[in-house]
């Protein structure tokens, strides 16, 4: 009987117990982006640091070629922040020239690529018009939410304009996921 | 044999199991800031409410003197939102005066102090240029991510200008962390 | 004795162990809002998709009539993003007309309704002045934090102006919660 003292009862456990420290987890940080070919109408994907400084991957969560690889099915919390910076947006120049005032924008998308679906799935999008008065502007877009993922799924972060991403500091632009 | 029925198998458990309700957790909320001495080139740290209203600390996660004290090594999700508010930024005044248009900015940094590294580590930064047309402006900066912390580490939230922080409501400006 | 090999010790476990996959969780996504009556000085609540596309509820976390229903007491991480979009805010029109320059604003509130308290409790608020130069603007407000909730509590997302919410894509505007 003693052996059962702290063994969870049948009512409490509907799935295998597992130690929290054993769950797939990753926090990736920004690196300088090398220009890569990307297709028309498709936002380019960022690549990331996965082991230096604050960055890590653990418990079979691997990073390869812009993708976080999901090693185990389950519910994951996924997050990213991208800090953008630029010179005065064209918006104000267009406005001064008296042309239609269409604002510029900055967009971050966290995308899932899965075997079971032919198209990538946009999980999260943060998009913001940029129509700044100042000559230099900078601002972050933060995203985070929970999704049910399958083993073998791949996650990436796409941005509207890779040249506007602030890659100078690991605390400004990052991407992470962890199994709940 | 019966005693083993729900004991996790060797394959499933690589670290001690622990009850989720027993994990260190804190959610701190804003209080009116008393001016404190801070040193040159160092953003001032906010202090926080830790037990009234929505605020709490539990399971050995303690708050003292601007710091959340990490009681146990592991992976933590850390988050903060700071709502800033101000009058028209100097940016537009500078612009009107015809001087170079350098935008003002607002910045939040979540900082770790650890005894295993000689200087504070910036974990997360949200920084935004402020160049508002309106006479009064207000806006939040939100941050959140996962980090591996050590027992004894200290976390704080630093801001670029403590006088711009909206301390009026506990739901506008807050800081929290929990062991995953 | 063998039966105890991986059973957690008394020191490690202070509450019943439970499988992570069995915890209440939900991720809700935006739908087109039908105009509903809301009381003066009270922000309207959004309603949500709870089962199509990326949306789901599981493990007794239910969605009904704009509310997430909390099935079990504990600490929950709650999050939402609302993307707003609009035409030029009145702010700039007021300014051109020489009247006092009061900025417009956009606000998101995550609210808890509980049996044990007569008033709804605002858990999280993101509020931002909008005083855009461009003719069309769009931007997200993101919120997320941890709260101690009671069985039977209800969560909703309120916004300052339902007509400004971008309901076009499930990745732009969403609401979720999960038991830690």
């Amino acid at each position: 009987l003693k052996g059962q003292e702290f063994a969870p009862s049948h009512q409490q456990v509907y799935a295998p117990l597992r130690a929290d420290g054993d769950k797939p987890r990753a926090h990736l940080t920004v690196v300088r982006q090398t220009p890569t070919q990307h297709f028309k109408n498709q936002f380019p994907a960022l690549h990331w640091e996965h082991e230096l400084g604050l960055a890590f991957t653990k418990n079979r969560m691997n990073y390869t070629n812009k993708f976080l690889l999901i090693p185990e099915s389950g519910d994951y919390f996924i997050y990213s922040q991208v800090t953008f910076r630029g010179m005065t947006s064209e918006c104000s120049e267009i406005r001064q020239a008296g042309r239609p005032n269409k604002p510029d924008s900055i967009t971050v998308v966290i995308t899932k690529v899965t075997d079971s679906y032919p198209e990538p799935t946009q999980l999260l999008m943060g998009t913001k018009s940029v129509c700044e008065v100042g000559s230099n502007w900078f601002q972050p877009i933060y995203l985070g939410a929970m999704f049910s993922l399958q083993e073998g799924d791949k996650l990436m972060v796409n941005v509207s304009d890779i040249s506007l991403v602030d890659y100078t500091k690991e605390d400004k632009t990052f991407f992470g996921a962890f199994l709940l | 044999l019966k005693g083993q029925e729900f004991a996790p198998s060797h394959q499933q458990v690589y670290a001690p199991l622990r009850a989720d309700g027993d994990k260190p957790r804190a959610h701190l909320t804003v209080v009116r800031q008393t001016p404190t001495q801070h040193f040159k080139n160092q953003f001032p740290a906010l202090h926080w409410e830790h037990e009234l209203g929505l605020a709490f600390t539990k399971n050995r996660m303690n708050y003292t003197n601007k710091f959340l004290l990490i009681p146990e090594s592991g992976d933590y999700f850390i988050y903060s939102q700071v709502t800033f508010r101000g009058m028209t930024s100097e940016c537009s005044e500078i612009r009107q005066a015809g001087r170079p248009n350098k935008p003002d900015s607002i910045t939040v940094v979540i900082t770790k102090v650890t005894d295993s590294y000689p200087e504070p580590t910036q974990l997360l930064m949200g920084t935004k240029s402020v160049c508002e047309v309106g006479s009064n402006w207000f806006q939040p900066i939100y941050l959140g991510a996962m980090f591996s912390l050590q027992e004894g580490d200290k976390l704080m939230v630093n801001v670029s200008d403590i006088s711009l922080v909206d301390y009026t409501k506990e739901d506008k400006t807050f800081f929290g962390a929990f062991l995953l | 004795l063998k039966g105890q090999e991986f059973a957690p010790s008394h020191q490690q476990v202070y509450a019943p162990l439970r499988a992570d996959g069995d915890k209440p969780r939900a991720h809700l996504t935006v739908v087109r809002q039908t105009p509903t009556q809301h009381f003066k000085n009270q922000f309207p609540a959004l309603h949500w998709e709870h089962e199509l596309g990326l949306a789901f509820t599981k493990n007794r976390m239910n969605y009904t009539n704009k509310f997430l229903l909390i099935p079990e007491s504990g600490d929950y991480f709650i999050y939402s993003q609302v993307t707003f979009r609009g035409m030029t805010s009145e702010c700039s029109e007021i300014r051109q007309a020489g009247r006092p320059n009061k900025p417009d604003s956009i606000t998101v509130v995550i609210t808890k309704v509980t049996d044990s308290y007569p008033e709804p409790t605002q858990l999280l608020m993101g509020t931002k002045s909008v005083c855009e130069v461009g003719s069309n603007w769009f931007q997200p407000i993101y919120l997320g934090a941890m709260f101690s909730l009671q069985e039977g509590d209800k969560l909703m997302v309120n916004v300052s102006d339902i007509s400004l919410v971008d309901y076009t894509k499930e990745d732009k505007t969403f609401f979720g919660a999960f038991l830690l």
């Epitope: - | 040193f39 003292t64 102090v113 005894d115 000689p118 200290k154 | -």
Partner: antibody, heavy 116, light 106 residues
Framework: QVQLVQSGAEVKKPGASVKVSCKAS????????MHWVRQAPGQGLEWMGR????????KYDPKFQVRVTMTTDTSTSTVYMELSSLRSEDTAVYYC?????????WGQGTTVTVSS | EIVLTQSPGTLSLSPGERATLSCRAS?????MYWYQQKPGQAPRPWIY???NLASGVPDRFSGSGSGTDYTLTISRLEPEDFAVYYC?????????FGGGTKLEIK
């Protein structure tokens, strides 16, 4: 400027205790960690332990665990190291230092002589 | 505890020469720290987190290494560089120092 000023030299008899102080200026000690290191004559450096002045939390080298006590008085920005049951081999220069904030600063040292 | 072994114990060189001081850990550490000490003075922080020079340290000094093997290098010795150098690890408790390398004028 940032500095640590330690108390003066001490001469103690075997079996007695000594309490060395270290007063900080130019920074808030609660923002850092304070360490104690000793150096016996002609020998190398030996880490004794550290205190987190914000929480009072200490970590000691097991070698000193039963004899050393580190404390803080935040109102005066001072940390203390008390070593009990002194023996002749405790004769050394005792240094306080800080970590968690650059520059990594050391006190000038306090000479403790244990002699009968 | 993690034992740090410094070699050589004493290094005799002339000004203008290159000096290489070694510190080996008994198990892997994240970073190494180096201190300079002159007779009658407190140790001075010299290199932190393996390769970062403390304020005021000339750039003829450099630090490198990872895992268990770390090195302090002085590209061209100046008279004021002759002193004792200690390595220290902060990765495991207790913190430990190496026994020191005495850099003396030949």
């Amino acid at each position: 400027q940032v500095q640590l000023v330690q108390s003066g030299a001490e001469v103690k008899k075997p079996g007695a205790s000594v309490k060395v102080s270290c007063k900080a200026s130019g920074f808030d000690i609660q923002d850092t960690y304070m360490h104690w290191v000793r150096q016996a004559p002609g020998q190398g450096l030996e880490w004794m332990g550290r205190i987190d002045p914000a929480s009072g939390h200490t970590k000691y080298d097991p070698k000193f665990q039963v004899r050393v006590t580190m404390t803080t008085d935040t109102s005066t920005s001072t940390v203390y190291m008390e070593l009990s049951s002194l023996r002749s081999e405790d004769t050394a220069v005792y240094y306080c230092s800080r970590s968690g904030g650059l520059p990594d600063v050391w006190g000038q040292g306090t000479t403790v002589t244990v002699s009968s | 505890e993690i034992v740090l072994t410094q070699s050589p114990g004493t290094l005799s060189l002339s000004p203008g020469e290159r000096a290489t001081l070694s510190c080996r850990a008994s198990s892997s550490v994240s970073y190494m720290y180096w201190y300079q000490q002159k007779p009658g003075q407190a140790p001075r922080p010299w290199i932190y987190a393996t390769s970062n020079l403390a304020s005021g340290v000339p750039d003829r000094f450099s630090g490198s290494g990872s895992g268990t093997d770390y090195t302090l290098t002085i590209s061209r010795l100046e008279p004021e560089d002759f002193a004792v150098y200690y390595c220290q690890q902060w990765s495991g408790n207790p913190r430990t120092f190496g026994g020191g390398t005495k850099l003396e004028i030949k």
